[in-house]
């Protein structure tokens, strides 16, 4: 059982109130993480309440502002970027959302040294991105697709790229999917340690079918949002990378990164690229069947002015069981030699752990096994390997951070996070100074989150950089549900889940049941984190039990439960959702005429299929932003878990389970079908033709459109929305209002 | 017009140590790596090494590693080539030569070369 | 190292004629983009003289006579009508791994 902020005495009960829907709505209960924004081994910066731009050391314990809020405000800046000379700071200001990561901003130059702003040679408006050089105060930035260099701020640019084209030829910034389904970034340049070099990566997505949406606005006629966007067995964009020598860029000017030849032979992805040192660098590429990956290592060959890639450093990874790597392939951590590496894939087992590959994949050394996995490889020293797993007391759902020593054999393994504050602290992450002198711990729950300051070599709390004091006396008075994480064990399999209860909570009595799903491929709902957010109201305040379950195809349980839905999608994580609820049923307290089911993108489309599963379980379920047919989804996404819609892959698993086909079987059910006609990821398509199956089929289903809102249906329409699903739910489950 | 023009020939006992010049002219000098290949009497070509004279970065054969020395001075466009512990089969032609810009390790410009007879 | 192997050792041809001149070597000299392969004429008590790069690409002042092809391990230089100031030593060299290395050479002298 998961303990939360702990309560007060039943004599003060009556004093304390249930959660309200706007207390949700407000972020009332929200808390805050400090992430130290590291510039030295032992230095930080960080932006203080009234939005100064403080620098801390954290050896001689002194602090100071090196730009003022003064100087903030002047250009209404957002956000800052230090120099790594510390001689000038780039405000950003006008920012301008796009995509998931990428936006649009001005930026103006600060010079340190003298206190103005730099004039001469500014930058244009509006930049696509923009970053200073790894040392000194080198600018790279993106303006209309093309890359530009300036040696010093002042300096005029350099351009790079001249090919650079809206929405055909993209230099230095991923296209759409490559931004949401493979980079995860905003950015896709990456200079070399020292600055030396920056290699970019060349999108061409001139054959990319394009989605086009309108957009409604307050215009006479709408405009139309035109997307190159690959689908399922479409054209995918045209991936090369470049480096460039950004002391002499205009020498031999930008050198293409050969493609591993066995890349190379057929439709391939660009899945990543990490600087080893200025003059050696990695790639990893990725087959269109994405169970194959290449890494290759590249060295600088000044006698060519270009990079040999020579086959005896390519590394290939492949899966005989599933898709490569996890939700991505994972990167590679260098150690110190500048050749051997850290990379996080499957044991013999089938679990995610860190090997050491120092000549061949053939011959790598694992550093650790068992049955857990992983996570993540924070930092390589000289001495120790930081990482996250979820191995400990084999909760699936937390993570801590370990310590192993590599300076020593053989290598001994501590747990850093693991009794430090055991009740409170369970899922953490890890930020690291330079050199790993330093490093803060960020604790997500299930506790009242904390962020904490250690010596990296003692692994000594040094201070606590954010307790989230305020949230925790405003909790004092809120009667919170209970949590329990728990497993159920059907048919060899494990089903981890996360129980939210009603405060007063009693076994004896029967409770309406609200399953929240999101079931995607590598995902996990069950964690050890904590949150006060719209089922935390409906548990509080409605008295309603919410359950989340992670079943097959779920992450970080091996591979036998990830790989599970390999080609097989929408029928596992469904099923696996069913089961769970009639365990639920057979612990007593569900009432199982109230149960329901919600889910949001991948989740609105398991809920969907869950609803229509014909199993009587469910009385009604909201789906929202769902994916219909895997046919409207992003190629690189869809083909990593499905292969191809083609008569000789798997297309007819890709027709069998579309929410189209199972349109009949919504007539028994209440159905609430929500999406935002301005959804760049998953379309508005995908709701309209559910609405069109279930019209054709003559079933009566209820549904919201939100105009000109994405994805995440924020803003006012997050009000909205959810105002709008707990009225469903209530009425669904008869709960008075 | 490209110009390498190399000292004069030298006549050394075994043991001792020579230092060839070449010196550029009709381009930028730190642009360029500087190749040294020699020829012994009525054989073929052996690459020595490269190096390059605006990042200073240099390129030995294995087989020469520590006995062989190559610098440059910007400031007079000159490249030198220092071989030390001569034996008698170090007699041969020695050639400065520019790595042509395209080429990928072809050279483009040649000196006229430095006969170095090592003999007791 | 990489071994080149050229051959013949020597081609005894007329003025006019046609010279295929080989060279093969121990291991593949290219990448999926370029090829590490050069060739050079050089005359007696002359220093060599660059005629081909990277395997096909002819240098600048150099008579369209003379070609080159090939790729991986062998590659072939051809002059396609001998004129008399061909007859020479033509060397094959490879910038594909250190070091460097040349071949033996090929003499071509006048039949």
């Known amino acids: 059982i998961v303990l939360r902020p702990s309560r007060v005495h039943n004599s003060e009960e009556n004093t304390m109130r249930a959660l309200t829907l706007k207390d949700i709505l407000n972020g009332t209960f929200s808390y805050k993480t400090f992430f130290p924004n590291w510039i030295s081994g032992q230095e930080y910066l960080h932006q203080s309440a009234d939005n100064n731009i403080v620098l801390y050391n954290i050896e001689t314990g002194q602090s100071y502002t090196i730009l003022s809020n003064r100087t903030m405000k002047s250009v209404n800046a957002s956000n800052y970027g230090l120099s790594p000379d510390r001689q000038f700071v780039y405000l950003e200001s006008d920012y301008s959302k796009l995509w998931r990561y990428s936006y649009t901003a001005t930026y103006y130059i600060y010079d340190l040294s003298n206190g103005e702003f730099v004039r001469g040679n500014e930058l244009p408006r509006p930049i696509q991105y923009l970053c200073w050089s790894p040392v000194g105060s080198k600018l790279a930035y993106v303006y209309q697709n093309n890359i530009y260099l300036k040696q010093r701020p002042g300096d005029p640019p350099f351009q790079i790229t001249f090919n650079g084209r809206e929405n055909k030829i993209f230099n230095g910034i991923p296209d759409w999917v490559y931004e949401e389904e493979m980079l995860a970034t905003k950015y896709a340049l990456w200079w070399s340690p020292n600055g030396k070099f920056l290699a970019y990566a060349e999108f061409n997505d001139t054959d990319i079918p394009v989605i086009a949406y309108s957009y409604y606005g307050d215009e006479q006629y709408p405009r139309t949002i035109n997307i190159p966007y690959p689908k399922a067995g479409a054209k995918n964009p045209v991936v090369r990378i470049f480096i460039i020598d950004t002391t002499y860029p205009a020498y031999v000017g930008p050198q293409e990164v050969p493609v591993p030849a066995m890349i190379a032979s057929s439709d391939y992805y660009f899945s990543w690229l990490t600087w080893v040192t200025d003059e050696r660098v990695c790639l990893q590429w990725l087959k269109r069947v994405q169970n194959v990956s290449v890494l290759s290592i590249c060295d600088f060959r000044e006698d060519w002015q270009t990079w040999d890639c020579p086959k005896t450093q390519e590394h290939i990874e492949e899966s005989r069981t599933g898709w490569a790597g996890g939700f991505f392939v994972s990167t590679p951590v260098f150690s110190y030699d500048a050749i051997s590496y850290y990379k996080i894939f499957s044991d013999k087992d089938g679990y995610k752990h860190i090997h050491y590959i120092k000549d061949t994949v053939e011959n790598a050394i694992q550093i650790t096994s068992g049955k857990w996995e992983a996570i993540n490889i924070f930092r390589v020293t000289q001495d120790s390997l930081f990482y996250s797993s979820n191995e400990f007391e084999e909760y699936p759902g937390r993570r801590n951070i370990y310590r192993i020593s590599i300076g020593s054999y053989p290598p001994s393994k501590k747990c850093v996070t693991c009794h430090l504050r055991k009740e409170r602290c369970q899922y953490y992450t890890a930020s690291f100074s330079d050199y790993a002198k330093y490093y803060a711990l960020v604790c997500y729950g299930p506790g009242i989150p904390i962020s904490t300051l250690h010596d990296g070599r003692t692994d000594q709390e040094i201070k606590i950089l954010e307790e989230n004091k305020e949230l925790e006396n405003a909790l004092k008075n809120i009667q919170l549900p209970k949590e329990e994480i728990k497993k159920l064990e059907v048919d060899e399999i494990t089903l981890w889940y996360k129980m939210i209860l009603p405060p007063q909570f009693d076994r004896s009595k029967k409770y309406p049941l609200l399953i929240q799903v999101y079931g995607g491929p590598c995902s996990q709902s069950v964690r050890s984190v904590f949150a006060v957010n719209w089922i935390s109201y409906l548990a509080s305040k409605e008295g309603m039990v919410i359950a989340l379950v992670d079943g097959r195809g779920t992450a970080f349980q091996g591979d036998k439960l990830l790989y599970a839905v390999y080609r097989k999608l929408g029928v596992y994580e469904v099923e696996d959702q069913i089961t769970a609820v009639r365990k639920f049923i057979e612990m007593g307290f569900i009432d199982e005429k109230r149960i329901a089911i919600w889910g949001w993108s991948y989740g609105g489309y398991v809920s969907s299929l869950a609803l229509a599963s014909g199993t009587g379980l469910f009385k009604c379920g909201i789906a929202v932003a769902p994916v219909s047919s895997w046919e409207y989804y992003a190629s690189v996404y869809t083909e990593r878990f499905m292969g191809l819609p083609t008569k000789d892959d798997n297309l007819e698993h890709y027709k069998n389970s579309t929410v189209m086909a199972r349109a009949e079987y919504f007539r028994n059910v209440d159905y609430l079908l929500i999406h935002g006609t301005a959804d760049d990821n998953v379309h508005f398509q995908n709701s309209a033709q559910i609405a069109k199956a279930l019209v054709n089929a003559q079933v009566d289903f209820q549904a919201m459109w939100y105009s000109d809102q994405n994805h995440g249906l924020s803003g006012l329409s997050t009000n909205h929305l959810y105002t709008h699903m707990t009225h469903f739910l209530k009425q669904c489950f008869s709960l008075s209002d | 017009q490209v110009q390498l023009v190399q000292s004069g020939a030298e006549v050394k006992k075994p043991g001792a140590s020579v230092k060839v010049s070449c010196k550029a002219s009709g381009y930028t000098f730190t642009a360029n790596i500087i190749h040294w290949v020699r020829q012994a009497p009525g054989q073929g070509l052996e690459w020595m090494g490269w190096i390059h004279p605006g990042s200073g970065s240099i390129k030995y054969a294995q087989k020469l590693q520590g006995r062989v020395t190559m610098t440059t001075d910007t400031s007079t466009s000159t490249a030198y080539m220092e071989l030390r512990s001569l034996r008698s089969d170090d007699t041969a032609v020695y050639y400065c030569a520019r790595h042509g810009g395209t080429g990928r390790g072809a050279m483009d410009y040649w000196g006229q070369g430095t006969l170095v007879t090592v003999s007791s | 190292e990489i071994v080149l192997t050229q051959s013949p050792g020597t081609l005894s041809l007329s003025p006019g004629e046609r010279a295929t001149l080989s060279c093969r070597a121990s291991q593949s000299v290219s990448t999926s983009a370029y090829s590490y392969m050069h060739w050079y004429q050089q005359k007696p008590g002359q220093a060599p003289r660059l005629l081909i790069y990277?395997?096909?690409n002819l240098e600048s002042g150099i008579p369209d006579r003379f070609s080159g092809s090939g790729s991986g391990t062998d590659f072939t230089l051809t002059i396609s009508r001998l004129e008399p100031e061909d007859f020479a030593v033509y060397y094959c060299?490879?910038?594909?791994?250190?070091?460097?290395?040349f071949g033996q050479g090929t003499k071509l002298e006048i039949k």
């Open positions: 060299q490879q910038s594909r791994e250190y070091p460097y290395t």
């Open positions: 990277g395997a096909s």
